[in-house]
């Protein structure tokens, strides 16, 4: 069976890494486990990994935004940032604003790798399932 | 044969959903049908679906922009928004501006699903084939 | 073996097209050659091609930004722009700013095609491996 995941935004995320909806809606989870915000790889190989985050706010103050997909493995002491997007000076001060960050690329992942998504400012994330998501599939 | 599509912008179109060039240029269409702006799935399975839209204007007024990929199937009464990007407060008032929205993710699609792209303001879309496109492939 | 590449930013790029790190870090290169900034296809077929570029500057002057993935083949006299992103009027004058451009789509590539990435303003690109990259894989 194809190893694939597509998880969508979960609005009761209160901490980092982001947590995801893994059951309802347009979610996919097959041959990959979901655990505490992370996608857990159980077969070494090449994977296309992607994430989109939708940031928005009522009154722009140009708080720097970052969106990272990173990997953690008990064999390594430190998280590895696989992909990252940053935004600074992206809206007009005081205005209602909205912006997305999209990341996607191919990586060689190892069994037991845990993949997560991090953002710099949780309060500015909108978690609609069509707007904020995290996924992968094995090539 | 691999089920795949890559359709490019069609500039003389005034209708929603967006219409696409399905014949000339860097277009691909194999094992998937194109009908009135939509990609029609004829085999159930996992697909990576993507779209990019290039918005631009002569004089910025920060008109809210949205870019959606949605699905329609005669079995369901309502369109399902699969992916969406929104932009607000994205340029400096009065200036010439340009911005892209990119969407891409994996979905479980069913035979007879029709996939479309919608934007909030057609007048602000530039339809160059390298800038505005819509595609998918079966995993 | 799966034909795949994921190359990351190389900060000593001084000319166009962009040059890439093809050896160290989270780089992948299998069944595809890397030559002077280009990915060289050695087997005709369908490929998903992607690139992200991270632009940033100390003081915004809204210099127009472009990010292109293009193809060159000795059989054709001219480069073919496969995907392109443009940005104009994207930050507040005088402020420190940062923005990414992401491109990704499916193409039918031919043996001996050379794929490259071009940007309009090299001095505004940040080459961190997680932020600026170029890749592909054969479907």
């Amino acid at each position: 069976l194809r190893k694939v995941a597509h998880l969508t935004g979960k609005s009761n995320s209160r901490s980092m890494p982001l947590e995801w909806e893994d059951t309802y809606g347009i979610v996919l989870l097959s041959g990959v486990k979901y655990k505490k915000g992370g996608l857990v790889i159980n077969e070494t190989g090449l994977y296309f990994v992607y994430s989109k985050v939708y940031f928005r706010g009522q009154s722009c103050n140009n708080l720097p935004l970052s969106h990272k997909v990173y990997m953690r493995n008990s064999k390594y002491p430190q998280d590895l940032v696989m992909m990252e997007g940053k935004m600074m000076s992206y809206c007009t001060t005081g205005q209602m604003w909205a912006r997305s960050s999209y990341l996607g690329a191919v990586f060689n992942l190892t069994s037991a790798d845990h993949l997560y998504v991090n953002v710099s400012e949780l309060s500015l994330v909108n978690f609609e399932e069509s707007q904020t998501f995290f996924g992968l599939y094995k090539l | 044969l691999r089920k795949v599509a890559h359709l490019t912008g069609k500039s003389n179109s005034r209708s929603m959903p967006l219409e696409w060039e399905d014949t000339y240029g860097i277009v691909l269409l194999s094992g998937v049908k194109y009908k009135k702006g939509g990609l029609v799935i004829n085999e159930t399975g996992l697909y990576f679906v993507y779209s990019k839209v290039y918005f631009r204007g002569q004089s910025c007024n920060n008109l809210p922009l949205s870019h959606k990929v949605y699905m329609r199937n005669s079995k369901y009464p309502q369109d399902l928004v699969m992916m969406e990007g929104k932009m607000m407060s994205y340029c400096t008032t009065g200036q010439m501006w340009a911005r892209s929205s990119y969407l891409g993710a994996v979905f479980n699609l069913t035979s007879a699903d029709h996939l479309y792209v919608n934007v909030s303001e057609l007048s602000l879309v530039n339809f160059e084939e390298s800038q505005t496109f819509f595609g998918l492939y079966k995993l | 073996l799966r034909k795949v590449a994921h190359l990351t930013g190389k900060s000593n790029s001084r000319s166009m097209p962009l040059e890439w790190e093809d050896t160290y870090g989270i780089v992948l290169l299998s069944g595809v050659k890397y030559k002077k900034g280009g990915l060289v296809i050695n087997e005709t077929g369908l490929y998903f091609v992607y690139s992200k570029v991270y632009f940033r500057g100390q003081s915004c002057n809204n210099l127009p930004l472009s990010h292109k993935v293009y193809m060159r083949n000795s059989k054709y006299p001219q480069d073919l722009v496969m995907m392109e992103g443009k940005m104009m009027s994207y930050c507040t004058t005088g402020q420190m700013w940062a923005r990414s451009s992401y491109l990704g789509a499916v193409f039918n590539l031919t043996s001996a095609d050379h794929l490259y990435v071009n940007v309009s303003e090299l001095s505004l690109v940040n080459f961190e491996e997680s932020q600026t990259f170029f890749g592909l894989y054969k479907l």
Epitope: - | S11, N12, S13, R14, M16, Q58, N61, L63, P64, S66, V119, S120, E121, L122, S123, L124 | -
Partner: antibody
Framework: QVQLVQSGAEVKKPGSSVKVSCKAS????????ISWVRQAPGQGLEWMGW????????QYNENFKGRATLTTDKSTSTAYMELSSLRSEDTAVYFC????????????WGQGTLVTVSS | EIVMTQSPATLSVSPGERATLSCRAS??????????IHWYQQKPGQAPRLLIY???HLESGIPARFSGSGSGTEFTLTISSLQSEDFAVYYC?????????FGQGTKVEIK
Amino acid sequence: QVQLVQSGAEVKKPGSSVKVSCKASGYTFTRFDISWVRQAPGQGLEWMGWIFPGDGSSQYNENFKGRATLTTDKSTSTAYMELSSLRSEDTAVYFCARSLISTAMFDHWGQGTLVTVSS
Amino acid sequence: EIVMTQSPATLSVSPGERATLSCRASKSVSTSDFSYIHWYQQKPGQAPRLLIYLASHLESGIPARFSGSGSGTEFTLTISSLQSEDFAVYYCQHSRELPRTFGQGTKVEIK
């Protein structure tokens, strides 16, 4: 900058036709609708219809169907509104306006053309 | 067709005061994304000028004292502190469906 320049005032007899022109500049003519709106003396605004210069498609207000004809000339970036079978109640200022396709707001207007229908 | 009703027909306000103009649609002009209502200002002998689009968005070049609000069928244009150049007729227009229709206008005059 965006400009819409209309033809001059007209005086017409009842039963005749009038053709008002609207020359656009400062933007890509084929990417926006041109709408026509009229205003009778001392009255409000009444939308007549739109035309999309990109493919020539058009839509009319039912009140003007069969009497109004909207056309464009892409080579000169000019839109035209012809109104036939004129009657005295057609006396009005006729405006052309650039209209965004989806949002359908009128963001730039011509200066207006006064058409007087009188015997 | 959707009928747009504006009130009051005439509003007498002193310079520097706040003006609140209402517009009611005979059916909803809102979707999940936007409210398709736009406001225009017209002075004698001139073409209308777009002020507010999609209910609450200020058009480029329009002073920030103009603001719009509302959704569904009830909409408001507010001028926070009237200047001499603001005395004019104001129209709302919907673009939810065909035909596009305008309200009959509200004349803002000097008190």
